[in-house]
Amino acid sequence: EVEKTACPSGKKAREIDESLIFYKKWELEACVDAALLATQMDRVNAIPFTYEQLDVLKHKLDELYPQGYPESVIQHLGYLFLKMSPEDIRKWNVTSLETLKALLEVNKGHEMSPQVATLIDRFVKGRGQLDKDTLDTLTAFYPGYLCSLSPEELSSVPPSSIWAVRPQDLDTCDPRQLDVLYPKARLAFQNMNGSEYFVKIQSFLGGAPTEDLKALSQQNVSMDLATFMKLRTDAVLPLTVAEVQKLLGPHVEGLKAEERHRPVRDWILRQRQDDLDTLGLGLQGGIPNGYLVLDLSMQEALS
């Protein structure tokens, strides 16, 4: 906290400029008018203030706007944004995408900080949903943004926004998140033809049910092994050898290298060894000939 002292003669700031970096903390406190600072915030970003000096400037704005800064000031905070706490940001009402972009630009190249996370949360809540423009902006700055949201938060993403999602945006999503996103993607891309549809839906297939995988196997899609390995195990298990062969096309040979990993391992255990042998890949571990397979889960459901 800077104690109140009178501004020395001739030092009263008439504008926000580089002469202020030569002021001591107490001089900044005494000689810079908060209202002047608020109207000329856009100049601060070009001036190399020390961290200590920035603390004083922030303190002045806090005094001027105890209920939270207006958006006209927030948009021009520049690197003073890095001094804000999540508690400060919770007082803000940010509605403009331009303001959001300006502040994300300040943090560009760094991990998402608690401040940025709070800012995004305030912005999205203010909008009521994660619209396409917002999603475009957020994933441009933070490719992993979507996967940082809970399934509940993802449920507010309208299908139309899915067009903004790039494959790398889903890299860190877990199955629960893909379970929410996949139906939205299916809806968003429903009017596309077979091959184009597959290109778009491929990244979301970790949330696809068995029946959709069966349908894809009829369309000569040639799914790569990386995509196959991300599919839900429970969705893969009911697929027949013939369906997997059609689904993977020429990539079916890759199953051999993955035979010890899920979901391939679990799928092999469910297939008849005779059927697996038809692939000619030397996959082992299937059900020997003459054995009967009882689906105990089905039996329990009936009893």
């Epitope: 580089e18 970096i21 970003n45 070009a46 001036i47 190399p48 520049g78 690197y79 890095l82 300040v106």
Partner: nanobody, 112 residues
Framework: QVQLVESGGGLVQPGGSLRLSCAAS????????MAWFRQAPGKEREAVAS????????IYADSVKGRFTISRDNSKNTLYLQMNSLRAEDTAVYYC?????WGQGTQVTVSS
């Protein structure tokens, strides 16, 4: 992003001279004010000299006026600080800054 790298620091006797350089890379510097700061052990960082890249305006701290000169070379994207008549109290780590970006600093020691 802007990267700033200072050089030219060292040990010098009182009354001697040094020339510090700050090489900038990354974003263009026209929109920034550039400055030299210094920080002595146990003291706050203080501004020594500044140059407004677009207007050319120069400002010096009272303690270095007439002894230090800040300049720039646009073609090399480099900032300089010519320090003459050095005193023991000029001993500090000297930092170059442009807007929000800071260099790592270079040590200047004035001692006999």
């Amino acid at each position: 992003q802007v990267q700033l790298v200072e050089s030219g620091g060292g040990l010098v006797q009182p009354g001697g001279s040094l020339r510090l350089s700050c090489a900038a890379s990354g974003r263009t510097l026209e929109s920034y004010v550039m400055a030299w700061f210094r920080q002595a052990p146990g003291k706050e960082r203080e501004a020594v000299a500044s140059i407004n890249w677009s207007s050319g305006r120069l400002i010096y701290a009272d303690s270095v006026k007439g002894r230090f000169t800040i300049s720039r070379d646009n073609s090399k994207n480099t900032l300089y600080l010519q320090m003459n008549s050095l005193r023991a109290e000029d001993t500090a780590v000297y930092y170059c800054a442009a807007g929000r970006y800071w260099g790592q600093g270079t040590q200047v020691t004035v001692s006999s």
